[in-house]
Structures are given as structure tokens and as C-alpha cells.
Amino acid sequence: IVLRPSRVHNSEENTMRALTLKDILNGTFSYKTFFPNWISGQEYLHQSADNNIVLYNIETGQSYTILSNRTMKSVNASNYGLSPDRQFVYLESDYSKLWRYSYTATYYIYDLSNGEFVRGNELPRPIQYLCWSPVGSKLAYVYQNNIYLKQRPGDPPFQITFNGRENKIFNGIPDWVYEEEMLATKYALWWSPNGKFLAYAEFNDTDIPVIAYSYYGDEQYPRTINIPYPKAGAKNPVVRIFIIDTTYPAYVGPQEVPVPAMIASSDYYFSWLTWVTDERVCLQWLKRVQNVSVLSICDFREDWQTWDCPKTQEHIEESRTGWAGGFFVSTPVFSYDAISYYKIFSDKDGYKHIHYIKDTVENAIQITSGKWEAINIFRVTQDSLFYSSNEFEEYPGRRNIYRISIGSYPPSKKCVTCHLRKERCQYYTASFSDYAKYYALVCYGPGIPISTLHDGRTDQEIKILEENKELENALKNIQLPKEEIKKLEVDEITLWYKMILPPQFDRSKKYPLLIQVYGGPCSQSVRSVFAVNWISYLASKEGMVIALVDGRGTAFQGDKLLYAVYRKLGVYEVEDQITAVRKFIEMGFIDEKRIAIWGWSYGGYVSSLALASGTGLFKCGIAVAPVSSWEYYASVYTERFMGLPTKDDNLEHYKNSTVMARAEYFRNVDYLLIHGTADDNVHFQNSAQIAKALVNAQVDFQAMWYSDQNHGLSGLSTNHLYTHMTHFLKQCFSLSD
């Protein structure tokens, strides 16, 4: 199936050019998306190209600037946030990245009523997190690991927590492992819907072992970065959840929310918090052995001034075939009765589907069903539920938006996006205004991305928000590779793959093959999305065939495929890449003497193991920032899929699945190993151990480190990295420079 319709007529072919590496490194062919910053049912804010903050009213068609670029520039603001009462705007500047989501910044409060910055009781700097209450203009912020509250921007702050300490106690923000592997946010505090209460997490990292690495910088002596980082089997953070009344916080103080007894009996995690009403909150907890999750609904008891979490409002989700949930345990979306909710979890056939829970999970009503998966619930209104799935035409790598009418019986289902721009758009996400009065659809491909605005009642398209016209024009004289998404059926396993083919691809010729792999649990690489990236260049200019394969362990095709890797990472993911390569060779257009594999992070692990599989299939390969032993990686992630590295649990497979154990097998391949020395995520230790094992085995290999670079290898390192990898592959494939 060719997903990118050709825009080329033969007469124009001589004016066409191939992609260059420079195109990729300069981001020449990057696309834009438009996500409205909704502030009501019919209004949204957007930062214009010239940096004004503009308010749009869909119903009147009017727009006006609420904050000029001059005001933004006066404090070098790169971000903003309007208070719900529309009286104030916070302006964010001095952005300083910490980990994946976290950063610190300086915040200024601008008073829209008088056009001046609020003076007196200014915010301290740098702040770790700041947010408005959902109603009015209260502010909660985290400074030096403690939480503060302001009733009004000009008021003095009330300090809610006092025990915050760098690398020890985190209040209102997650520690490293919770940020990266559990919450996937920079914050750990949540306002109740009307701003009466503020819930927050406290993470105690006092007993967690610390990863230490050198940051070389420019000084005479390197700095040492210390991060409490629990590796598999190590001591984990201790979490507690508190709720404080923000109206008169000095009186009652923070109230600790009780942990369900069945969770508290052993090591556990807090996984998410969802406010239902101002006086009802839902917390999700997870056992350290992550196959049991408990959803607990707690109510505020006015007479006791406390939070009560009755056992009758505890809902257990358990997996008998793998871990609980997909990548994370799904979060509930509550209905208007404020007690029943919709949630995605596995049905009896092992497919993730939407269920409606009114009293118990056992009595859940299944809302969607089929041999496909519901992926995200966007919004529940009184009469509709909007969700995304990969049902349409049985392509797991697509995403369409559906509406189920829950107000009528039987509920009817409508695909909102399936036929809108069928060739161009097969992978959508959506953003809804209050009460789903309007919504934006963002299409990511396979054609050029486009963002559109729609009426929430009729689904009618109102206007195009961004259609990437400049990109479309820029690509007119570019010879883009062809892309196809197909599947292989092997031993009752379906292996979906994406193949990227050179522009003048000829099935009768032989091409070098590069496998790009990620392959991590609950990931998906074969997606119907638009991209002009490094592998596009390799196909377009260097004439390579690139393939991506979703094997066992990958997502959205049912639990059988997903949980196949449970407790045995590094086995089936590698097998399935190898199986696919053999099938590609059988197709007749692959030069079997020129096959390579590369991957980053989990993909670096898989590519390393594939190279060391002893099959003789691969001539060369690259591992960027690979995991080399699961004992070196984070507890929350690793143990979810592998259990504990203890004798009575799964130590044997931890030991068997290392890259180092296969050092001898690298002798007959060309291996390029790459890692950033300041990788906070997959520590440089992983590559250091691979290198040591290869040296000890007297196996030759190539390596590149990037000083002071993290897991993303950003900035100038990116250019160096892709240039270096290109040279390596061209040499491997005997392609002239």
C-alpha cells in the first residue's frame, strides 16, 4: 500500500532532487501542528507567528490580542498562562531543562486590568512548577521542593510544605523515576475542579541509591551529578498523598490520603490522581510487582474534615498474563453522576477496550469490542463519548476518532475522521473545548499534517487551523521515498512492517537494507504518520531500503502480542526482527550481503542483541544509548516487564539477557556503539560495560561518546551523530561518499 500519493509527473522528474543530510539536520521539512489553548466552550488562545497572544471566539468570529509581543519580549517570555478569571497572565522565561518533562523557570505575573506587572510579593526564582487554580486566580507553585500557595498574585505566599530537600524530599514535583516512568509529568499536584482543595504527592528518596556521573563542563574539575535513581531491585521512593483546603489552609493542615490496605501491605507506587468533584477524588495505586492496580475513590467528610476512602469504592485491576495496563495503567474518565466512570482495560479476549464501571469492575459494561484496541478516551459529555482506536480497516498503526452516543440506547458509534481526508489523514489526535462544544483535529499523516477545527455537535469542519502549505510547496521538487505498510504472517504471529523505498525503486534490483528498531514493550513503530527524517534521506539519496517492524511486545494488537515478552525481555523482540529480515530477503530485492540494523535506547539494546545473534544476517549495526543489562535500568520500568532480579524471582533471565553475555558474537559484525556521557536515563555505564566486555573478548568495534550529552543527544551533537552514522553505514554498504 503506497501511503504517499505521488505528486510527480515524468516531465517534472529532471527538476526533482533527492533529500540531503543537510535538509534533515536543518529541519527544512519539519511540519507544524495547531493545538488550541482552550479557555471556554467557544474560545481559545493561540500564540501568533509574531508572538502576540490572541484570543479567538469561534462563535463571533472575533479575535483580539490579550498580550502583545512587546510585553512578552519585555521579560523574554517563552510561554504564558492565563488565569481562569482572565485577570492575570503568568509569563515564563529563563527556561532551564532538567529531565524529560521537568524544567525550572522565572515567572512574572501580568495584570491585564491595568496593563502592568504585579509588584510586591514577587515570585522567587527559579520555580520548579507553577499553575493557576481552575477557577479564579489562586496560584500554586513549587520552589526548592516545597509547595506554596497564593490566594491572589499580589498576596504573600503561604508555605504548605516545609520538608522539601534537594534529592531527598520532593513535594508537588516527582523525583526522577516517577517523572520518567510513572507520571510522565513535571508536576505532582492537582487542583480540585473549583480550586477548593489542592492534592499533592510527597516523594521521599532518602534511602534510594544514587547514580553519580561526571559533567565535564568548562571548569578545571568536572562536576558530579547525583540523582537518586532506583535501578531494578533497589530501594524505591516512598510516596504519600496529601490534600489541603486552600481557602483556609492554615487551620486544618494537609490531610494524608490513606493507601488501600491490599496495596500498603508491600512496596507500592502511586500512579495517578483524578479529581471527580471538589469533594471526591480518585487515586490509583500499583503494587511494586505491577500486575495489581487499585483505583480508590475518596470522599471529603465535612463533619470530620477528612478524606474517607471506603473499601466499597476500591476497584481492583489485575493481569494474569502480564503487567497491569499497557505502558501505564489507564486513567478513569468520570461521567456526570460523579461516581461511574469509563476506563480502558483488557477484555476477556485480551484486547484493550473501553468499559463502563458503575459499581464493581466485575460488573463492568463493555463499550467497545473487537480484534483491535481502544487507545484513548478524549472526552465524556452527557450524551457522547469521544475516543481513538485503530479499528478502521484493521491497520494497527492508524488512529481515528470515534463518537459513541451514550445518551441514547442502544449506543450508536460513528467514526468522525475515517473518511475526512482518507489518503492524507489516517493518524489523528484531538483537542476538545469545554463540554466538547468544539474540537480540533490534528492529523499527523501519512500525508502532510493538517489541523482543523470542528463543531462538537455536528462534527462539521469549521476551518483549517494549519495546513503546512509552505512545507507542501517546499516538497514539490523533492524526490521523497515511497512508503508502504504491510504485514507478514509468521507462525501465527502478525508482524506489521513499514518499508521505506528509494524514489526510483525497482523490484528487480538489489538494495541494501537498514532495519530501524525500537521494539520496547507497548511501543509502536509502524504508524501511518508523516516524517521527513534521517531514514527518508537514506532512502532518497543513498538508495537504501529501510524497514521498521513491530514484533512481539509491541502495542495495540492485543495482549497475546503485548505480553509475549513478559519476564523475558531481549528474546522475542530480537527473534521477530530476524524473522522479518529473512522474509524481506525472500522478497527478492534485498542485497543479503548488505543488511544493517540500528536503534536508540531500547532499540539500541535490540540492535545489539540482533547483531550478536550469530545468524550472520547483519553486516553491521549501530546502537545509540543502549540498555546493556536490565540490572542497570530503572526499577519502575524494568520490573514492570521483568519482575525482580532476585534468585527466587527472575535473576536468571536478568543475567541471560545482557549484551555483555554475547560479546564473542560481535566478532563477525561491524558494531558502532554510541552514548552520551551525561545520560540521566540510560546511564553511560551501559555502554561502558559493553565496551569492557568487547575489549575483554578482544573483539574490535567502533565507538563514539558525546561529552555532557543526555539521552537525547541534542544540539550540535545531533548533527555530528547523524553525519557519523551516515559515514558508518555508507562504508558498511560500500556506497561512495
Partner: antibody
């Protein structure tokens, strides 16, 4: 009717220890933060320590930090203040009060602690 | 820490008169975090005005609290015989919570 009843005060030598108790009744003790406030003879009020409802977080005035420990037993509806390394300047009437940092809406009658050699 | 200064130190008034007691903070506090207490001789303090300028349960409406920022006032509209006592203001916005030194309202 809300009642707070302090006990455990008395005469103690400098460097000595005392444990004050406050028995609560008439309200759901386990739901509320509690504090200790003291008043030296003929002087004003001074906040000493506070503890949240679950007992999971405690707070102290600098003047007593490291020497005093606040705790509670919610099953017994009782608040405690363990006072070690007592000094002459700790001499005061010690009140237990319902509340965290402010709005102390119920107070006990107090118990006198005298530190003297 | 926040220092609260109460004035006057002593207020001599007759029953039926209006009493105005002042409390000044060394830093901005706001009424959400300021309370007033009454302490009779040999008695425990009693909450009069709760944080947020709200009268505490059972307190007669002749007592009222006002002010914002750093300046706060407790007003007793008509003094009754039982009102002659020491009055303390207290802030709860910052640790440690602190009390003013007190204003003694005595019978003239």
C-alpha cells in the same frame, strides 16, 4: 462538647525530660491537626509544635527543634509532647490546641512546666 | 519569622465604649491567615476571629476583624464587662506561627 485536657506537667531540673499528654474528646480527633502553644509566666503566647491529622508530618519552633518531639495516638485520641534537655526558658504553661498554624479554635486549660534546679 | 506588633499595649475604656485594637505585621500576611484571641486572667486563650476575618463559633457580633496586608484591626463595638481581657493577634501564613505581644483592655 469539645474538651482538651493536658497532663504531665511539673517541676523538672535543667537537662531533664517530661512527657506531656493531651486527651481529646467531643470531636473526631484523628481528622485534625493539633498544636502545642506555651506561655511563660506573665508573657505572651508562643507556638511550639504542630502535627497533622495522620501524624505523618511534624513542625517545630526553632527554639525547641531537636529537643522536643510531638506525636499522637489516634486510637487513644491523645496528643503528646516529649520534652528532652529542658532549659529554664522552657518554663511555661503548655496548652494543647486544635489547629495547624492558625485559627486554634479549641484550647486545653494548660499544664505548668517548671524547669528549675 | 514574622513579627506582629500590637498597639496600644494597654487600652483603658469603660463598658459600652468602642475598642479598636491594632496589629501590624513585619511582612504582608493578608486576612486569610490572621486570627484574634481573647485571654481572660488565669484562663486559656479563646478564638474570636478566625483566619479570613470570620467570627469563630459562638462569638457575639460586637467583635469584628478587618484589615489586609500588614495592618489589621480588631473592633469591639460596645464593651461588655466580660470583654476586659488580653487580646492577641496571630499569623499563620509562615512557619513559625507567631503571636503579637498582646493588648490589655482594662476597665477605666
Amino acid at each position: 462538647e469539645v474538651q482538651l485536657l493536658e497532663s504531665g506537667g511539673g517541676l523538672v531540673q535543667p537537662g531533664g525530660s517530661l512527657r506531656l499528654s493531651c486527651a481529646a474528646s467531643g470531636f473526631t480527633f484523628s481528622s485534625y491537626a493539633m498544636s502545642w502553644v506555651r506561655q511563660a509566666p506573665g508573657k505572651g503566647l508562643e507556638w511550639v509544635s504542630a502535627i497533622i491529622s495522620s501524624g505523618g508530618l511534624t513542625y517545630y519552633a526553632d527554639s525547641v527543634k531537636g529537643r522536643f518531639t510531638i506525636s499522637r495516638d489516634n486510637s487513644k485520641n491523645t496528643l503528646y509532647l516529649q520534652m528532652n534537655s529542658l532549659r529554664a526558658e522552657d518554663t511555661a504553661v503548655y496548652y494543647c490546641a486544635k489547629g495547624w498554624f492558625g485559627g486554634f479554635n479549641y484550647w486545653g486549660q494548660g499544664t505548668l512546666v517548671t524547669v528549675s534546679s | 519569622e514574622i513579627v506582629l506588633t500590637q498597639s496600644p499595649g494597654t487600652l483603658s475604656l469603660s463598658p459600652g465604649e468602642r475598642a479598636t485594637l491594632s496589629c501590624r505585621a513585619s511582612q504582608s500576611v493578608t486576612s486569610s491567615y490572621l486570627a484574634w484571641y481573647q485571654q481572660g486572667p488565669g484562663q486559656a486563650p479563646r478564638l474570636l476571629i478566625n483566619v479570613g476575618s470570620r467570627r469563630a463559633t459562638g462569638i457575639p457580633d460586637r467583635f469584628s476583624g478587618s484589615g489586609s496586608g500588614t495592618d489589621f484591626t480588631l473592633t469591639i463595638s460596645r464593651l461588655e464587662p466580660e470583654d476586659f481581657a488580653v487580646y492577641y493577634c496571630q499569623q499563620g501564613i509562615m512557619l513559625p506561627p507567631t503571636f503579637g505581644q498582646g493588648t490589655k483592655v482594662e476597665i477605666k
